[in-house]
């Protein structure tokens, strides 16, 4: 089955720049199908833009302004790039690659879209560290000795663009667990986000991970917020607690506060 | 030009409660066209539900169906037994590929209609309130609550700053909250809330301790200073006299 | 302060065509989409066109489509609009007016936030 | 084309009164292409409202947009005797024309 993946979740450029998307196809070989762009404005319907056959034949809509966006494909990397030219307000919007994809029975056919990249423009050069800053609270003894649940809570402040995602994961799992977030919140001329992860009793000894997708993220990777394992009654930590690493390869600090 | 057009722009459903998403076509005969559903959840992601011809997307089958209203040019799509997963953006789209003769291979989309999942109605259930806390960052955890109308009020003579709370449906489809503010004096904060008529308190769920169960760290063993080497900790610390604060450096 | 200035407007004859201009200054108007909206005596605001900031996007009102064109000299901070086969129906108050610009957070909001005094148009014989 | 349609024609306030002004588009209007204008006589408009609830720069807090789909509203919370002019609701988004209501004027009464 094909897959499509937009490693960029947000492209951010100022006026008149260039703006190059990707979209990254496997579980088929993109020399032997189309790749298609759609775009979606706020409120708009998503609206076809080009695409790309098997052949590399380029066919645009009618409508779209000539010279403004270019397709192609890189087969080495099963890639395909939309570029977006001379980059103006009215090219703001989220950009989706898709391909129509086989189903075993003959003649049956959908079409799968990638998961988008918002193209953000601004009039300015953001120069300071607008990556997403976090924060983490740990659950309550309350909550732990009563519910037999524990809460753990992401706080992510400080960035831009608003685009961000966030999902957790138990330490050496690779599975997504169910997590209930906030809406994303302006705070001057940033955003912050919040999401929390209500996990049973026996696995609260288990490291659980905020994971945080953001294109400001150091080095273009995920930002892995570590979670330390608790004990009910009480919280040890081992040394590699202290040593816990995100995806950049960055010392995570645990800084632990006691009152009183 | 063709044209899909969604019949509503939002349809709240009930959780496990059926409900129905219509979108007609103008200009055209929907016969002459390839329906087709996708819903967009959260985060952007586009995923297939449904095309004519009896093909549904991974997980998709049991609890939706499609259909066509060749009489009336609209398209259907029921959801059998919604759940809080199925809240998102739904969109109609056609294509004429495989019909032959002049064919597109495009989709044309709608408008997106908005549903939104609230829990079915049930016996009112008293919230749980925990405070959780971090240097001047309190969260106040509302757990398990029905109806959804709730006030949260984070008790605090020195407020820095206060966030709206964040309402959402649980799994078990009751209401979950969290409300966030910074405060000076955060030690002190405490969180209280109106629900159904009644105020609920932070404290009601505090758990007594005996103080002398507790190990205090030395000063400085209060932060961890960056270091190539890790030491272990030497103390043992109680969950509810621990913040925990991860920074990247 | 930021300004729009118009000119160009004047008494013409159905049929007849004018060339309006618009002149920005303190700010760089190749930042900026810009519009056209006109308001005729004793009635409401209509939009007339708009040009994106690079003029790759140009879109006209029904009313005026064919027979108006919108440009903009970004090197001269100047916006026009070229009007031929004037009616009696276009006799108006011609504005030129700046859509807000894409910093800060609401980067992809849009509103008229500068306006020029506009410039009067009429069409009679 | 999407219609804007504002009511009422006329609202006849005294100052210190709050003016309720609504804008109805004849389909679903993105929030972030909903401005409203304030205009008096013999001067160019003024934008008031963006993105359907922000305020412009120097615009007063007594005026506040609300709304979203198709129904919105301008709210000036307490009349001064400046606020006695015509206003417009506009959506500048979806396809072209960037339609303009017909207006709203809020007079003395």
């Known amino acids: 089955a094909g897959h499509l993946e937009q490693p960029q979740i947000s492209s951010t450029k100022t006026l008149s720049k260039t703006a190059r998307l990707e979209c990254v196809v496997s579980g088929i070989t993109i020399s032997a199908t189309s790749v298609y762009w759609y775009r979606e404005r706020p409120g708009e319907v998503i609206q076809f833009l080009v695409s790309i056959s098997y052949d590399g034949t380029v066919r645009k809509e009618s409508g779209i302004p000539s010279g403004k966006f270019e397709v192609d494909r890189i087969p080495e990397t099963s890639t395909s790039t939309l570029t977006i030219h001379n980059v103006e307000k009215q090219d703001i919007a989220t950009y989706y690659c898709a391909l129509w994809e086989a189903q075993q029975e003959l003649g049956k056919k959908i079409k799968v879209f990638g998961p988008g990249t918002k193209l953000i423009i601004t009039d300015k050069q953001l120069d300071a560290d607008v990556s997403p800053k976090p924060t983490i609270f740990l659950p309550s003894i309350a909550e732990t000795k009563l519910q037999k649940a524990g809460t753990y809570l992401c706080l992510l402040e400080k960035f831009f663009p608003d685009v961000i995602k966030i999902h957790w994961q138990e330490k050496k799992s690779n599975t997504i667990l169910g997590s209930q977030e906030g809406n994303t919140m302006k705070t001057n001329d940033t955003y912050m986000k919040f999401s929390w992860l209500t996990v049973p009793e026996k696995s609260l000894d288990k490291e659980h991970r905020c994971i945080v997708r953001h294109e400001n993220n150091k080095n273009g990777v995920d930002q892995e917020i570590i979670f330390p394992p608790i004990k009910t009654d009480v919280i040890t930590m081992d040394p590699k607690d202290n040593c816990s690493k995100d995806a950049n390869d960055t010392l995570l600090l645990q800084l632990t506060n006691t009152s009183a | 030009a063709i044209e899909l057009v969604p019949e509503h722009q939002t349809v709240p459903v009930s959780i496990g409660v059926p409900a129905t998403l219509r979108c007609s076509m103008k200009g055209e005969a929907i016969g002459n066209y390839y329906i087709n559903w996708y819903r967009k959840t959260q985060g952007n992601t586009m995923t297939f539900i449904y095309r004519e011809k009896d093909i549904y997307g991974p997980g998709f089958k049991d609890n939706f169906q499609g259909d066509i209203d060749i009489a009336k040019n609209l398209a259907v799509l029921k959801i059998l037994a919604p759940s809080e997963r199925d809240e998102g953006s739904y969109y109609c789209a056609c294509d004429t590929l495989g019909m032959g003769g002049e064919y597109t291979d495009k989709l044309i989309f709608g408008k997106g209609t908005r549903v939104t999942v609230e829990p079915r109605s049930q016996p009112h259930t008293k919230p749980s309130v925990f405070v959780m806390k971090n240097g001047t960052n309190v969260a106040c955890l509302v757990k398990e609550f029905y109806p959804k109308d709730i006030r949260i009020n984070l008790v605090s003579s020195k407020k820095i700053t206060e966030f709206d709370p964040a309402i959402v449906i649980s799994p078990s489809g009751k209401y979950n909250a969290v409300k966030l503010g910074k405060y000076e004096d955060s030690n002190s904060v405490t969180c209280s809330v109106q629900h159904d008529n009644k105020t609920v308190h932070s404290t009601d769920f505090e758990v007594k301790t005996d103080s002398t169960d507790h190990v205090k760290p030395k000063e400085t063993e209060n932060t961890k200073q960056p270091s190539k080497s890790c030491h272990k900790p030497k103390a043992i610390v109680h969950t509810e006299k621990v913040n925990m604060m991860s920074l990247t450096v | 302060e930021v300004q729009l200035l118009e000119s160009g407007g004047g008494l013409v004859k159905p049929g007849g065509s004018l060339r309006l201009s618009c002149a920005a200054s303190r700010f760089t108007l190749s930042s900026y989409d810009m519009n056209w909206v006109r308001q005729a005596p004793g009635k409401g605001l209509e939009w007339v066109s708009s040009?994106?900031?690079?003029?790759?996007?140009?879109y006209y009102a029904d009313s005026v489509k064919g027979r108006f064109t919108i440009s903009r000299d970004n090197a001269k901070n100047s916006l026009y609009l070229q009007m031929n086969s004037l009616r009696a129906e276009d006799t108006a108050v011609y504005y030129c007016?700046?859509?807000?610009?894409?910093?800060?957070?609401?980067?992809?909001?849009?509103?008229?936030?500068?306006w020029g005094q506009g410039t009067t148009v009429t069409v009679s014989s | 084309e999407i219609v804007m349609t504002q009511s009422p024609g006329t609202l006849s306030l005294s100052p210190g009164e709050r003016a309720t002004l609504s804008c109805r588009a004849s389909q679903s209007v993105s929030s972030s292409y909903l401005a409203w204008y304030q205009q008096k006589p013999g001067q160019a408009p003024r934008l008031l409202i963006y993105g359907a609830s922000s305020r412009a720069t120097g615009i007063p807090d007594r005026f506040s947009g609300s709304g979203s789909g198709t129904d919105f509203t301008l709210t000036i919370s307490r009349l001064e005797p400046e606020d006695f002019a015509v206003y417009y609701c506009q959506q500048y988004g979806s396809s072209p024309p960037y339609t303009f209501g017909q207006g709203t004027k809020v007079e003395i009464k």
């Open positions: 007016a700046r859509d807000r610009g894409v910093g800060g957070t609401d980067y992809y909001y849009y509103g008229l936030d500068v």
């Open positions: 040009i994106s900031s690079s003029s790759s996007y140009i």
